[in-house]
Interface confidence: medium
């Protein structure tokens, strides 16, 4: 299915724990902390064995002469994120001893900007997408992915970093947003809600989806994530909404069936390589694009967001597994790990297709469409 009120197509739980780790699901849960009614929460951290917060753990990409490694952005501030007033967040956070500015959480104090000033920036993510206000840009060509179909070996690291479940990707996954806009995939992670409560980060005309996948990329113009942070186009994230469908999604099941092994915050397991592109919608030609930020501290701006119009379908059981298996720190379930939508502040969301045409049955009055600002660059 397409996004609601957008036109045409859209498809994540399931599973039981991987048979190779019968002991794997032992972390300490407990009641969710009371959500704070302040600001929104933010998104994953920048990677490394220690999972420092910042948006999704961003593995370091070194020059070709060096080995690829995992980036510990220990110099980046991290914070506890305030809660989304409409969708309270769980107070999952990560503490780093000896530094009270090195942890953040969904739904708690202090406000993110207090620790990472960029979180108060004008061009933050996620945002609410209003298709009728999107600028149709014919120059936005279909996305190109190369090397995303991974063989079973070598295995990949699947980790519960306390903020999300993250799959670290090996070198060689290339993505192009267009001519000269080339990126390397670093990692993917998910955002979700709780029972009966959706948890996507982006919304469409205020509609929040059950979950959302983010595939994080580093521009080939940069050798390292820390060099790219805050630079326009330095990072790019492919985002897709996950919806409930009638059938089990076999691609997602390869990951979801292993979640019990990493129920504990900070735990990880190895999973066979898989077709990463199968986790994304099949239509790479229809998407929304805008410039925003990481959705967790350090909230660095300049991130190019590409949000697919088509959604991905998972079974109800799979969505339940996603939202009900993992634990964060502090004896709390890892749920509702999304940041509230941020104001556009004049930004125009571009669409690779005429999204404003007959796409929103709710629209009662004609809407002035924005014009395409980019020349397709």
């Amino acid at each position: 299915q397409r996004l609601p009120r957008m036109q045409e197509d859209s498809p994540l739980g399931g599973g039981s724990s991987g048979e190779d780790d019968p002991l794997g699901e032992e972390d300490l849960p407990s009641e969710e902390d009371s959500p704070r009614e302040e600001d929104p929460p933010g998104e994953e951290d920048l990677p490394g064995e220690e999972d420092l917060p910042g948006e999704e753990d961003l593995p370091e990409v070194k020059p070709k002469s060096e080995e690829e490694g995992s980036l510990k952005l220990e110099d980046l501030p991290t914070v506890e994120a305030p809660g989304d007033p409409q969708e309270p967040q769980n107070n999952a956070h990560r503490d780093k001893e000896g530094d009270d500015q090195s942890h953040w959480r969904y739904g708690g104090d202090p406000p993110w900007p207090r620790v990472s000033p960029a979180c108060a920036g004008r061009f933050q993510s996620p945002v609410d997408i209003r298709p009728q206000l999107a600028a149709f840009c014919p120059a936005l060509r279909p996305l190109e992915l190369l090397g995303f179909q991974l063989p079973p070996l070598p295995e990949l690291r699947l980790r519960n970093n306390g903020h999300s479940v993250q799959l670290t990707l090996p070198p060689g996954l290339e993505m192009a947003l267009g001519p000269g806009r080339e990126y390397r995939a670093l990692q993917l992670h998910l955002h979700w809600g709780a029972a009966g409560r959706p948890g996507s980060e982006h919304t469409v005309e205020g509609h929040r989806f059950p979950a959302e996948i983010h595939v994080v990329h580093l521009s080939t113009a940069f050798a390292r994530v820390d060099e790219a942070l805050g630079r326009p186009g330095g990072l790019a994230v492919l985002a897709a909404f996950l919806e409930e469908g009638p059938e089990e999604n076999s691609a997602y099941e390869q990951l979801l069936s292993r979640l019990e092994e990493i129920a504990e915050e900070g735990s990880e397991t190895q999973v066979p390589g898989l077709d990463i592109s199968a986790l994304l919608p099949s239509d790479f030609s229809r998407y929304f694009q805008y410039e925003g930020s990481l959705t967790t501290p350090p909230c660095a701006q300049g991130v190019i967001w590409t949000v697919f119009n088509q959604t991905v379908m998972l079974s109800a059981k799979q969505l339940h597994t996603l939202s009900d298996t993992l634990w964060g720190p502090g004896d709390s379930r890892l749920q509702l790990n999304f940041r509230a939508t941020q104001p556009l502040n004049g930004r125009v969301i571009e669409a690779s297709f005429p999204a404003g045409v007959d796409s929103s049955p709710r629209a009662a009055e004609p809407v002035q469409l924005n014009s395409c600002l980019a020349a397709g660059d």
Epitope: S16, D20, L23, P29, E264, S267
Partner: antibody
């Protein structure tokens, strides 16, 4: 703390149900296992159950004969043992075996002796 | 199934000795290995997890190393209370090694 009970003498082919009462930690948050040790022998993992109870695992030596279950409302783990054999004679421990960063690591009960003999 | 081969099956040592016990997995288990100490009539006690992480409260004379298929437990200076049986345990499977009994020479 984990406290096992239900052990005893049983004839070959008979059945026995072991219980393990948990206290002092959030039982419903942990996968729990049964491990046994035959007299004078080493440790043998028998079975495990995930914290929700939705996933169970068994050693080949007991598959089809033993059933692990849990009642999180009672903070209790069970092991139903059917078709018992002489080689099942052992001290049975319930254990939260997989260590976890930041938590108390492994927790074991004191064990309960099961003797299968005619 | 993953098999764990522990050696030696027994050893005699004196107080103050450096003792090394090895465990080999039949296939790669990354660092998913623990070491337990057991004394007669008692439940096992966790010493090391994740191959080299010392469990809280365990004396620093115990250390673990290794990754993949080959692992080692080292007691740097054997103390009287260390005479016991030691088991490696891989929690990918899970399976125990057959045990190493450390006796007084």
């Amino acid at each position: 703390e984990l406290v096992e009970s239900g052990g005893g003498l049983v004839q070959p082919g008979g059945s026995l149900r072991l219980s393990c009462a948990a206290s002092g930690f959030t039982f419903s948050s942990y996968g729990i296992s049964w491990v046994r040790q035959a007299p004078g022998k080493g440790l043998e993992w028998v079975s495990s159950i995930s914290y929700s109870g939705s996933n169970t695992y068994y050693a080949d030596s007991v598959k089809g004969r033993f059933t692990i279950s849990r009642d999180n409302s009672k903070n209790t783990l069970y092991l139903q043992m059917n078709s018992l054999r002489a080689e099942d004679t052992a001290v049975y421990y319930c254990a939260r075996m997989k260590p976890m960063r930041g938590y108390s690591g492994a927790v074991w009960g004191q064990g309960t002796l099961v003797t299968v003999s005619s | 199934d993953i098999q764990m081969t522990q050696s030696p099956s027994s050893l005699s040592a004196s107080v103050g000795d450096r003792v090394t016990i090895t465990c080999r997995a039949s296939q790669d288990i990354s660092n998913r290995l623990a070491w337990y100490q057991q004394k007669p009539g008692k439940a096992p006690k966790l010493l090391i997890y994740d191959a080299n992480s010392l469990q809280s409260g365990v004396p620093s004379r115990f250390s673990g190393s290794g990754s993949g298929t080959d692992f080692t437990l080292t007691i740097s200076s054997l103390q009287p209370e260390d005479f016991a049986t030691y088991y490696c345990f891989q929690y990918s499977g899970p399976t125990f090694g057959q045990g190493t009994k450390v006796e007084i020479k």
